[in-house]
């Protein structure tokens, strides 16, 4: 058993049929010595008396808010949550496996630049009685500060018969140098509580590996005289690290119709312009990637050919 | 400790091409090592990230773009002095700081070159003959060092009398390649910045 926060405790349980569970001793936070009784949740049934209460925690029915009273007055609360371990593996029932970039990916994180700011998100099908708390640091043995905001519901989607909820959080490394060479990874830890179930999820990464630039901005077309060719130009996204001559991007320019299976023109360039062949009912799209360290491509920025 | 904006003419900067070749060569070598040593801990997640140049050179700080010198987090207190007669400078106006930056890069290359050569000598003794260092990568390091053209004491190649532990050597190769790739990225960014300035 360990304390998650004030008056909230996590009981770690090996979860299998007829498991003995964990013996837990609760102590009432009061100077009083006698006349103390204990109840669980909304029930008025007295579970025991005295300053301490010993319970055997085996299942979710044994978890919940234990309250000690004296003469009708509440003295203190202790909320017990359960953390299940099945076959030596901690449960991951609350969050959905995103399976990208690999199996057992529950948290995904991205950074728009090298400033030390990043966003992480996760998915769940649970809609109520759900809370998240996020902590982060650079390194684990001698952790350096990363400040994370509160996790918020950022999107709702319908997937078949189920609704899927996306939560996200923004974090900022306290003292980040965009040009620094990372040797210690960022660690992100998410505590998830659904009703009386506790789970924790972690992710470890270097900012350089989660870089995904914003799409290029200000796409413009200039038809070339006596030619089907069009000069397309664009600019670096505002959110990208500066100076751009140091933090350079490379670009992919593509002309394609509405269907992915349609024929296309595609060219890669380090410049902020390119010449492509435009077709009727097609779009010109441009995306960006760090020129020197190949992490993710940005989303496409598009303009119609016509 | 930072790069000035007024530096060489874009066409006068011979090191940019060499630094691009360097990044390409080390990336290819790292990819080859990951594939060949698939049953060794050789991915970024599996290895310890060590920097053999730590406390010996200060390339990131010495080569910091002017625009980042306002960022407190980028200003490290480490100071290192270097010889300043590089041929990549290509301009009389080149400042002492830029010379410091380029000589720091030269020192990095020299240290990695020694490590890689020592390691290759060990790998050549491996009866499995599983992996060797790409000669192209060693040649590219040499070319960039020649283009930088700094005079500096030659570092003797480390020789070891004890029987090499090939497992450890291969893991060390992975660690070294990961670190060198990160440094090659920095070098490429620096050269690109200097070329554009």
């Amino acid at each position: 058993i360990w304390e998650l926060k004030k008056d909230v405790y996590v009981v770690e349980l090996d979860w299998y049929p007829d498991a003995p569970g964990e013996m837990v001793v609760l102590t009432c936070d009061t100077p009083e010595e006698d006349g103390i009784t204990w109840t669980l949740d909304q029930s008025s049934e007295v579970l025991g008396s005295g300053k301490t209460l010993t319970i055997q925690v085996k299942e979710f029915g044994d978890a919940g808010q234990y309250t000690c009273h004296k003469g009708g007055e509440v003295l203190s609360h202790s909320l017990l949550l359960l953390h299940k371990k099945e076959d030596g593996i901690w449960s991951t029932d609350i969050l959905k496996d995103q399976k990208e970039p690999k199996n057992k990916t529950f948290l995904r994180c991205e950074a728009k630049n090298y400033s030390g700011r990043f966003t992480c998100w996760w998915l769940t099908t649970i809609s109520t009685d759900l809370t998240f708390s996020v902590k982060s640091s650079r390194g684990s043995s001698d952790p350096q500060g990363v400040t994370c905001g509160a996790a918020t519901l950022s999107a709702e989607r319908v997937r078949g018969d189920n609704k899927e909820y996306e939560y996200s959080v923004e974090c900022q490394e306290d003292s980040a140098c965009p040009a620094a060479e990372e040797s210690l990874p960022i660690e992100v830890m998410v505590d998830a509580v659904h009703k009386l179930k506790y789970e924790n999820y972690t992710s470890s990464f270097f900012i350089r590996d989660i870089i995904k630039p914003d799409p290029p901005k200000n796409l413009q077309l200039k038809p070339l005289k006596n030619s089907r060719q069009v000069e397309v130009s664009w600019e670096y996204p505002d959110t990208w690290s500066t100076p751009h001559s140091y933090f350079s991007l490379t670009f992919c320019v593509q002309v394609q119709g509405k269907s992915k299976r349609e024929k296309k023109d595609r060219v890669f360039t380090d410049k902020t312009s390119a010449t492509v062949i435009c077709r009727k009912n097609a779009s010109i799209s441009v995306r960006a990637q760090d020129r020197y360290y190949s992490s993710s491509w940005s989303e496409w920025a598009s303009v119609p050919c016509s | 400790r930072n790069l000035p904006v007024a530096t060489p003419d874009p066409g006068m900067f011979p090191c940019l091409h060499h630094s691009q070749n360097l990044l390409r060569a080390v990336s290819n070598m790292l990819q080859k090592a990951r594939q060949t040593l698939e049953f060794y801990p050789c991915t970024s997640e599996e290895i310890d990230h060590e920097d053999i140049t730590k406390d010996k050179t200060s390339t990131v700080e010495a080569c910091l773009p002017l625009e980042l010198t306002k960022n407190e987090s980028c200003l490290n207190s480490r100071e290192t002095s270097f010889i300043t007669n590089g041929s990549c400078l290509a301009s009389r106006k080149t400042s002492f700081m830029m010379a410091l930056c380029l000589s720091s890069i030269y020192e990095d290359l020299k240290m990695y070159q020694v490590e890689f050569k020592t390691m290759n000598a060990k790998l050549l003794m491996d009866p499995k003959r599983q992996i060797f260092l790409d000669q192209n990568m060693l040649a590219v390091i040499d070319e960039l060092m020649q283009a930088l053209n700094f005079n500096s004491e030659t570092v003797p190649q480390k020789s070891s009398l004890e029987e090499p532990d090939f497992y450890k050597t291969k893991i060390k190769l992975c660690i070294l390649l990961h670190a060198f790739r990160i440094r090659a990225v920095t070098i490429d960014r620096v050269m690109s910045y200097l070329n554009a300035s």
């Epitope: 349609e262 023109d265 060219v267 | -």
Partner: antibody, heavy 118, light 107 residues
Framework: QVQLVQSGAEVKKPGSSVKVSCKAS????????LHWVRQAPGQGLEWMGW????????EYAPKFQGRVTITADESTSTAYMELSSLRSEDTAVYYC???????????AGQGTLVTVSS | DIVMTQSPLSLPVTPGEPASISCRAS??????LHWYQQKPGQAPRLLIY???QSISGVPSRFSGSGSGTDFTLTISSLQPEDFATYYC?????????FGQGTKVEIK
Amino acid sequence: QVQLVQSGAEVKKPGSSVKVSCKASGGTFSDYYLHWVRQAPGQGLEWMGWIDPENGDTEYAPKFQGRVTITADESTSTAYMELSSLRSEDTAVYYCARNKELRYFDVAGQGTLVTVSS
Amino acid sequence: DIVMTQSPLSLPVTPGEPASISCRASQSISINLHWYQQKPGQAPRLLIYFASQSISGVPSRFSGSGSGTDFTLTISSLQPEDFATYYCQQSNSFPLTFGQGTKVEIK
């Protein structure tokens, strides 16, 4: 399976024209760009131009501009390359090639040898 | 026009040994570079597109690398069927241009 079948070998006199055909099978004809590339005996490859069979758009290499015409007939899934004012240096194997990507080719025909000789 | 220069023009190799072919562009072409294999009397066959992307059906011993002006096609261990002529082609701008070809022959 995508296939491109070209017309047979031709012998032509200098100053005349030649029209080589390329019939496509497998896949929708207009879903691909079609290129013509030639190769003189013992020499390398030389790109001549492309056509978009969907709309008839063409682009030619400056070297052949004014002498080459590439056309396509969607109804028969056939592309044609006509080269006029033939000279001896036009003696070559002419290949048609196609791809969904405009700037390179993933399937080519078997080639048509055009010999220009007086 | 962008000029593509291949080297060497002839490459004698022992079967089972690796082979590398170089292709240099007269100006930077990013990764707009493709490799073809051609055997006598046959049409060119695409091996690698956009400098390093492999084609399904092409043996994994063929790999490509490079960007900017310098590119390499590597055959990790030459098989008897790999003896052929190899061409690089740039797609950075029209007209599309090819290298002169490198003939890989049995040593």
